[in-house]
Interface confidence: medium
Amino acid sequence: MMTGTIETTGNISAEKGGSIILQCHLSSTTAQVTQVNWEQQDQLLAICNADLGWHISPSFKDRVAPGPGLGLTLQSLTVNDTGEYFCIYHTYPDGTYTGRIFLEVLESSVAEHGARFQIP
């Protein structure tokens, strides 16, 4: 039975050229987290593996930094970075938990962070 919930940074916005932290937090479960994947649509951005540590996909190495924690930092943002991002927690014995973040990259200097929300 999957009892956990993923809390994410929700809908967020940031300025073009700036950076943003994508964060998810898994709670309400004692399951072991064996790996966390960060994906944009079906593209793998990064993996944090319990045994091996971080791996950043080669095509994102220049603009993606691991952390803080199990989060991911996106740098040198462009308008093309606008879209859905997913944190996928692989756990035992629960299985797979997925959290969603929507990032909007704005041309203007007015970029407000959205509220946090729960994904069951």
Partner: antibody
């Protein structure tokens, strides 16, 4: 070319023990989660055990928990399955598989080794 | 445990036919559904991962779709070399479970 070659199968009496090995080549073995999956004669597939890349985490279904132990030697590129207290229902072909944890899919399988538990 | 129910359990079709196999999960598994092909006397081979993604080197006549509890596997034009048993497998929750298999034969 990725290769997984199982060995160690054979005939064993109920209550007995057997150790299966899987020699891996053609990829960086220490970077991959590995599993054993079995198939009873004429039946479907059943997941048996999984071990994380560094060996820190092991997972089993209830049907084998406490009887089977999965382990690995990354220096030797070898995966193991120690099977104790064997039962007739453990008779099957045992496949060594490589997991792509990013997909939760098994992308390479060995040819299998047959384990027969019978008196 | 999550139960995976495949249908049909077997089918017979002609070369060139469109073949469809369904897989139903007993609870929501999102897109964590894989399809494998097992030819007689051989090990299974991964064809489709995460419901709809074609594994590298697999012919494009194979495809998959679905999410949640209902999934479909399709061979758009059946070829003689496609004679095999096809299995779905869920990767949402431990223990990972497989469907009972669908045996595909040529008429």
């Amino acid at each position: 070319e990725v290769q997984l070659v199982e060995s160690g199968g054979g005939l064993v009496q109920p209550g007995g023990s057997l150790r299966l090995s899987c020699a891996a080549s053609g990829f960086t073995f220490s970077s991959y989660t590995m599993s054993w999956v079995r198939q009873a004669p004429g039946k479907g597939l059943e997941w048996v055990a999984t071990i994380s890349s560094g060996g820190s985490y092991t997972y089993y279904p209830d049907s084998v928990k406490g009887r089977f132990t999965i382990s690995r030697d990354n220096a030797k590129n070898t995966l193991y399955l120690q099977m104790n207290s064997l039962r007739a229902e453990d008779t099957a072909v045992y496949y060594c598989t490589r997991w792509l944890l990013s997909l939760y899919a098994m992308d390479y399988w060995g040819q299998g080794t047959l384990v027969t538990v019978s008196s | 445990d999550i139960q995976m129910t495949q249908s049909p359990s077997s089918l017979s079709a002609s070369v060139g036919d469109r073949v469809t196999i369904t897989c139903k999960a007993s609870q929501n598994i999102n897109v964590w559904l894989n399809w494998y092909q097992q030819k007689p006397g051989k090990a299974p081979k991964l064809l489709i991962y995460k419901a709809s993604n074609l594994q590298t080197g697999v012919p494009s006549r194979f495809s998959g779709s679905g999410s949640g509890t209902d999934f479909t596997f399709t061979i758009s034009s059946l070829q003689p070399e496609d004679i095999a048993t096809y299995y779905c497998q869920q990767g949402q929750t431990y223990p990972f479970t497989f469907g009972q298999g669908t045996k595909v034969e040529i008429k």
